[in-house]
């Protein structure tokens, strides 16, 4: 997803952020999940994307670009509403579904010009096109009923590029799916830590071979596994130390001793 300057941002007056945490630097935290998030960049005065590790970090972190702008850019909602009210349906509403090249499997919505409705589709996590909305409501406001809904213009933030589907109609496909061997997972009541520490090691969907560590809640130890570069789950750490730091604190050894530190 691109971080292009938004036309409306340049119109915003005061450069002082609305909240002190908006001035904090992006902090991905010590964990190694890969969660697309947004932060307010004090230097560019824009909300920008970063990859959050899944734990710790700071308050300058938002799930959506829209949420970031509403929270940290003074006067953003007012300006965005003014820009969108009475607008015609944007051209990108007519673009065909494009899942993009990545393998992230995200639930998204697009406007289907055949059915004249917003529909769910699976987005891979990068590239694709701007007919791509995080919520059904957002899609409807912008593409189904653009005139009657004076709401902020979609900020899925794709670069200006050329993309179109259906170059040929060939349907053959190959699935490169690695089915991981699931280690023994203890009963949930034995573990009080982060939920993903209970997940089995998952090699993911791709073809790389990266050394990673996962927390085995049955043994209370972090073990090495090969990660293929995409997919998988959040029980995935680049070092044994990070793995232990994130997951070991939640293991209940027995009733008298409590949590292992």
């Amino acid at each position: 997803l691109s971080e292009e300057a938004d036309d409306t941002d340049s119109e915003l007056g005061s450069m002082k952020p609305l909240h002190t945490f908006c001035a904090m630097k992006a902090d991905d935290g010590p964990c190694k999940a890969m969660i697309r998030s947004y932060f307010f960049n004090m230097y560019t005065h824009q909300c920008e994307e970063f990859i959050y590790g899944g734990c710790e970090g700071n308050e300058n972190r938002f799930d959506t670009l829209e949420e970031c702008k509403k929270t940290c850019i003074p006067g953003y909602e007012k300006t965005a509403v003014k820009a969108a009210s009475g607008a015609e349906r944007p051209d990108f509403c007519f673009l065909e579904e494009d899942p993009g090249l990545c393998r992230g499997y995200m639930k998204r919505y697009l406007y289907n010009n055949q059915t004249k409705q917003c529909e769910r589709f699976v987005y891979g996590g990068c590239l694709g096109n701007r007919n791509n909305f995080e919520t059904l409501d957002e899609c409807k406001k912008i593409c189904e009923n653009p005139v009657h809904s004076p709401s902020p213009v979609n900020e899925v933030q794709m670069s200006d590029y050329v993309t179109d589907g259906n170059t040929v109609t060939d349907r053959s496909t190959v699935n490169n799916i690695v089915v991981p061997q699931s280690p023994k997972v203890p009963r949930r009541r034995d573990y009080r830590g982060r939920p993903w520490c209970l997940q089995p090691a998952d090699s993911g969907l791709c073809k790389a071979s990266e050394r990673r560590f996962y927390y085995n809640s049955a043994t209370g130890k972090c073990h090495r596994f090969n990660y293929t570069g995409c997919g998988g789950n959040n029980n995935n750490f680049t070092t044994r130390r990070r793995c232990l730091r994130s997951c070991k604190t939640g293991l209940i050894k027995n009733k008298s001793k409590g949590v292992v530190k």
Partner: antibody, heavy 124, light 107 residues
Framework: QVQLQQSGPGLVKPSQTLSLTCAIS??????????WGWIRQSPGRGLEWLGL?????????AYAVSVKSRITINPDTSKNQFSLQLNSVTPEDTAVYYC??????????????WGQGTLVTVSS | DIQMTQSPSSLSASVGDRVTITCRAS??????LHWYQQKPGKAPKLLIY???TLQSGVPSRFSGSGSGTDFTLTISSLQPEDFATYYC?????????FGQGTKVEIK
Amino acid sequence: QVQLQQSGPGLVKPSQTLSLTCAISGDSVSSNSGGWGWIRQSPGRGLEWLGLIYYRSKWYNAYAVSVKSRITINPDTSKNQFSLQLNSVTPEDTAVYYCARYLGSNFYVYSDVWGQGTLVTVSS
Amino acid sequence: DIQMTQSPSSLSASVGDRVTITCRASQGISSYLHWYQQKPGKAPKLLIYGASTLQSGVPSRFSGSGSGTDFTLTISSLQPEDFATYYCQQQNGYPFTFGQGTKVEIK
């Protein structure tokens, strides 16, 4: 081990069509874990991305705006290869052309395997 | 298009030196930045993807860092086989664009 083998003429006349083929071994052109593309390199312009194709239950493509009106990248599933066609070439299109595999991860797309390169000269 | 600017354009170094190459994007690109190495007459070779993840089989003396607009490729101890040209490339949006390259030469 994935390998890409390029083939095609090294000399093309101005206004004609440049055609190159990239044969894939060790992977499938219709694999759903990435895509296939073309990049060229010339002393004047450096490395220039031209476009790519990928398969996700149907075929998709993306082309650089600079060549959009002249370029076609097509898969050939029967031969497990893909091709580049660049129409109406001029001497400006003289470059070393590379095919590449684009591997898609959760958030990243990168060229992890490249063809050997083909020097294409456009001259009468 | 997103412009990628590398510095320096070339540098001279000795075996064992620590070498740092920087790449700046004309706009924020999160961590969608990859590094390639190219030797004369050869195709580029992927070193690092996602700004900091080492590609399988690449020696650990190579490392990458940065996010947003400023990125760095570091070779901790230069080896004879590392004399080459290095390119950064953004994948934030189409068209993918490359830096102009940094040539690492023997001092």
